[in-house]
């Protein structure tokens, strides 16, 4: 279980304003059981972007179908990018816990930069 890695293959991604950004993330194992979450930024002030376990995030769709029981691709697509979306995004694996899930392992992060909309 300690061998699980969260892989974010892209160090950086550049997207034009108004376009969609795809942020790639894969896990190397189904173990331990627990959800994936995406955050912008690190530390206590980080912003939740997507939570596999809870809620609906209208601007975010998963690239693959997470309801498939053997899925290990947790890449997301964020629609209608604006300059305010720039930052470093982390794909974080949580281990199922009681009462709360516990952060288990984070990807290295992907820096999203936003280019001006082509005129």
């Amino acid at each position: 279980e300690e061998g699980l890695q969260v892989i974010q293959p892209d160090k950086s991604v550049s997207v034009a304003a108004g376009e969609s950004a795809i942020l790639h993330c894969t896990a190397t194992s189904l173990i331990p059981v627990g959800p994936i979450q995406w955050f912008r930024g690190a530390g206590p002030g980080r912003e939740l972007i997507y939570n596999q376990k809870e809620g609906h995030f209208p601007r975010v769709t998963t690239v693959s179908d997470l309801t498939k029981r053997n899925n290990m691709d947790f890449s997301i697509r964020i629609g209608n990018i604006t300059p305010a979306d720039a930052g470093t995004y982390y794909c974080v694996k949580f281990r199922k816990g009681s009462p709360d899930d516990v952060e288990f392992k984070s990807g290295a992060g992907t820096e999203l930069s936003v280019r001006a909309k082509p005129s």
């Epitope: 959800p35 939570n51 596999q52 376990k53 809870e54 809620g55 609906h56 209208p58 769709t61 998963t62 179908d65 997470l66 309801t67 498939k68 199922k96 009681s98 009462p99 709360d100």
Partner: antibody, heavy 120, light 107 residues
Framework: QVQLVESGGGVVQPGRSLRLSCAAS????????MIWVRQAPGKGLEWVAS????????YYADSVKGRFTISRDNSKNRLYLQMNSLRAEDTAVYYC?????????????WGQGTMVTVSS | DTQLTQSPSSLSASVGQRVTITCGAS??????MHWYQQKPGKQPKLLIY???NLEAGVPSRFSGSGSGTDFTLTISSLQPEDFATYYC?????????FGQGTKLEIK
Amino acid sequence: QVQLVESGGGVVQPGRSLRLSCAASGFTFSDYGMIWVRQAPGKGLEWVASISSSSSYIYYADSVKGRFTISRDNSKNRLYLQMNSLRAEDTAVYYCARRYYGFNYPFDYWGQGTMVTVSS
Amino acid sequence: DTQLTQSPSSLSASVGQRVTITCGASKSVRTYMHWYQQKPGKQPKLLIYSASNLEAGVPSRFSGSGSGTDFTLTISSLQPEDFATYYCQQSNEPPYTFGQGTKLEIK
């Protein structure tokens, strides 16, 4: 084995209130989102409300928004539906169901339902 | 809201027959379409999740296909216990919506 047992249904006058309960057993309740779905006599299924595993995310159908409140008590393995200002069109069998993880998952187990009749 | 339209609304068929029920969505739901079976006086039962995945314990004569806006539930060889009402349901975005149901009756 997974069990969901609804209770609290009955006959109630328009404008009054009723509280439904769903007792869950056979699985880790706090891992699952929960849903209320209703079915009027002779009609199809209508989603009413859903609540995420930690109660952080709650959604309602427009037809019940402002009148119904979904809640849960993970320490008691119970789901609730508080129904206020009841109308004749709320008459239905109310089912609770569970949903693993996030919004996109299906409802894999359902209770047997409890009947609510709103009539003067 | 995403509207779901099932076709046909009712269907008469014989044991052993192959039956297909379709569900059309008013906008793309990706693959987040699920199918349920309901018998009179009973709660719904999940058959197929995410368009094409057979729920555990469901006989292999049931199958599902589709993505985007067009989905199909197929029963390859009807058995007596399959006569029931079938519903599609999307979970791509709130609010969750169901199709109006397809009642499958014995011919």
